[in-house]
Interface confidence: low
């Protein structure tokens, strides 16, 4: 969630005399933004999956989309503005650095970082968020994107329980996955997702989507996508919208079959997949038997597993 | 040679549940890829695709008749039964059973169909 | 869900006679299109998968084409035992759906 984006002014300076009384105000002014920040967050939180379902459900209805689009956003726009303008206030008072804030990798491009790789975003306070290592893609599509999930090597199982998925597991420049509470933060602020997908034969494709939201743990990390583009054939996604995240511990599925452990990963599982993008890695010779494997329905169908997948997303006002 | 043969009561009454029976020859349902799908069809009308389940037991439904059905099957016993609930007259129809071969969700061998009539 | 037209609901022809049967699909559906085969009081036979690929045994006059959103099956030249219902099915994504139907009848 991009919460400041404008430029934080300089620290006014302190007149010696009254220097304590105002830092004392200054502490108590900060402590009250902190806490209605806070309450404006788990507000926020509670309210911002209703208003994605709102939105993705006016994409659809073409008459009637642009009104309701228009005030689901300005809804959610109002709510962010108000977190803005707190975190604004309280960021003068306590900080310089805010305005050098970084939340993703897009904020990395803005700031001219424009090599693909490993980044440390810092903790953010506000949010509550630690310090992550993440993998930016500052090329393809114009760049700013943060990577999500790799298969590429086959070294890191992906048959893992909720915690894992949780918290995120893998080695960050191989085969990974960042997290979901790590995906769901990302994703608080309008963001997009691209799926890119290469076979054993050396073909490439993407889908991409205008929409994504990844839910909070009590909503178990439901996966929220809007319009499709792309060129790999079908929209192997979408049989997924909507959809709570299941692992071989927790089924959240929609099927009488615990479609997590049928499939061997953890996913967006409905009964069972059109895509299994965290499957098992099959290499070359094994890579067309299985169902269980990394698989885009309608590409090469439901028993090819892919040779190398990449999730990544960006907000979606980004501007190269 | 490949066969497929529904089997079922033809008369239902209303709000009763009907189970139908697909007993195959030819072709094994442990083989992976292999499906079988049910799809019914009411007299004069179009075809309706209902249910499909695999060798691997993945299973899939059509999202209105979706709390009405049940797909299992038996792989040793060489049959895939469906239970219907809640049984209506505009349920009247032949019921089909198919065999889907690869993942491309299409039915390229057909039982004969077995006619149902849901009346009181 | 993705509903499929099929167009026109009946047709008459005459034996010898070249005929296309179209269907459109509500959205975007690639190649995964079927064709089927219906006579009267008979279970449906594939004709075409994959919008295009023929099916063992059926005759090479039967042919199918289109990707996207618009389809057509043709027939060459039409033999008396063509005269049937033919209907499209999606392929793309569950729930599967067929078209309406199109009525060959003999002129």
């Known amino acids: 969630q991009k919460l400041s984006k404008h430029k934080t002014p300089a620290q006014p300076q302190l007149k010696a005399a009254n220097c304590c009384e105002e830092v004392k105000e200054l502490k108590a002014q900060v402590a009250n933004l902190s806490s209605l920040l806070s309450e404006l967050n788990k507000k926020q939180e509670r309210d911002w999956v209703s208003v994605v379902m709102q939105v993705m459900e006016l994409e659809s209805n073409s008459k009637r989309m642009e009104s309701r689009l228009t005030d689901a956003e300005s809804k959610y726009s109002e709510m962010n503005n108000q977190i803005d303008i707190m975190q604004l206030q309280a960021a003068q008072t306590v900080t310089q650095t805010s305005a050098d804030a970084i939340y993703d990798c897009s904020s990395l491009y803005q700031k001219n970082y424009r090599i693909s790789g490993v980044y440390k975003l810092p903790p953010d306070d506000f949010l509550g968020s630690p310090e992550l290592e993440v993998f930016c893609d500052m090329e393809t599509s114009g760049g700013g994107w943060t990577i999500i999930q790799r298969r590429k090597s086959g070294l890191v199982s992906f048959y893992r329980d909720w915690k894992q998925y949780k918290q995120g597991f893998g080695s960050i420049r191989g085969d990974f996955w960042l997290g979901n509470e790590h995906i769901h933060r990302l994703s608080r602020q309008p963001t997009r997702l691209r799926v890119e997908m290469e076979d054993w034969e050396g073909n490439l494709r993407y889908a991409e989507y205008s929409h994504f939201v990844l839910g909070n743990e009590l909503n178990s990390y439901r996966l929220f996508l809007g319009n499709y583009t792309g060129n790999v054939g079908n929209d192997a996604l979408q049989y997924h919208n909507n959809t709570a995240f299941s692992t071989k511990d927790k089924d959240n599925d929609n099927c009488l079959d615990k479609c997590a452990q049928l499939r061997k990963g953890g996913y967006w599982y409905n009964c069972c997949t059109d895509s299994n993008l965290n499957g098992v890695y099959y290499r070359l010779g094994e890579h067309n038997k299985h169902l269980d494997g990394i698989t885009w329905y309608g590409w090469h169908g439901s028993t090819y597993s892919l040779k190398r997948v990449e999730m990544k997303i960006r907000p979606e006002d980004f501007k190269p | 040679q490949i066969t497929l043969k529904e089997s079922g009561p033809t008369l239902v009454k209303p709000t009763q549940t009907l189970t139908l029976t697909c007993t195959f020859s030819?072709?094994?349902?442990?083989?992976?890829?292999?499906?079988v799908g049910w799809i019914r069809q009411p007299p004069g009308k179009a075809l309706e695709w209902l249910a499909l389940?695999?060798?691997?037991?993945?299973?899939r439904y059509s999202p209105s008749l979706k709390s009405r059905l049940t797909i299992t099957k038996d792989t040793s016993k060489n049959l895939v039964v469906l239970t219907m609930t809640n049984m209506d007259p505009v349920d009247t129809a032949t019921y089909y059973c198919a065999r889907d071969y690869g993942d491309y969700w299409f039915f390229d061998l057909w039982g004969r169909g077995t006619p149902v009539t849901v009346s009181s | 869900d993705i509903q499929m037209t099929q167009s026109p609901s009946s047709l008459s022809a005459s034996v010898g006679d070249r005929v296309t049967i179209t269907c459109r699909a509500s959205?975007?559906?690639?190649?995964?299109l079927a064709w089927y085969q219906q006579k009267p009081g008979k279970a449906p036979k594939l004709l075409i998968y994959?919008?295009?690929s023929l099916q063992s045994g059926v005759p090479s006059r039967f042919s199918g084409s289109g990707s996207g959103t618009d389809f057509t099956l043709t027939i060459s030249s039409l033999q008396p035992e063509d005269f049937a219902t033919y209907y499209c099915q999606q392929s793309f994504s569950t729930p599967l759906t067929f078209g309406g139907g199109t009525k060959l009848e003999i002129k």
């Open positions: 959205q975007g559906i690639s190649s995964y």
């Open positions: 030819g072709f094994s349902l442990s083989t992976s890829g292999v499906g």
């Open positions: 994959a919008a295009s």
């Open positions: 389940i695999y060798w691997n037991d993945d299973k």
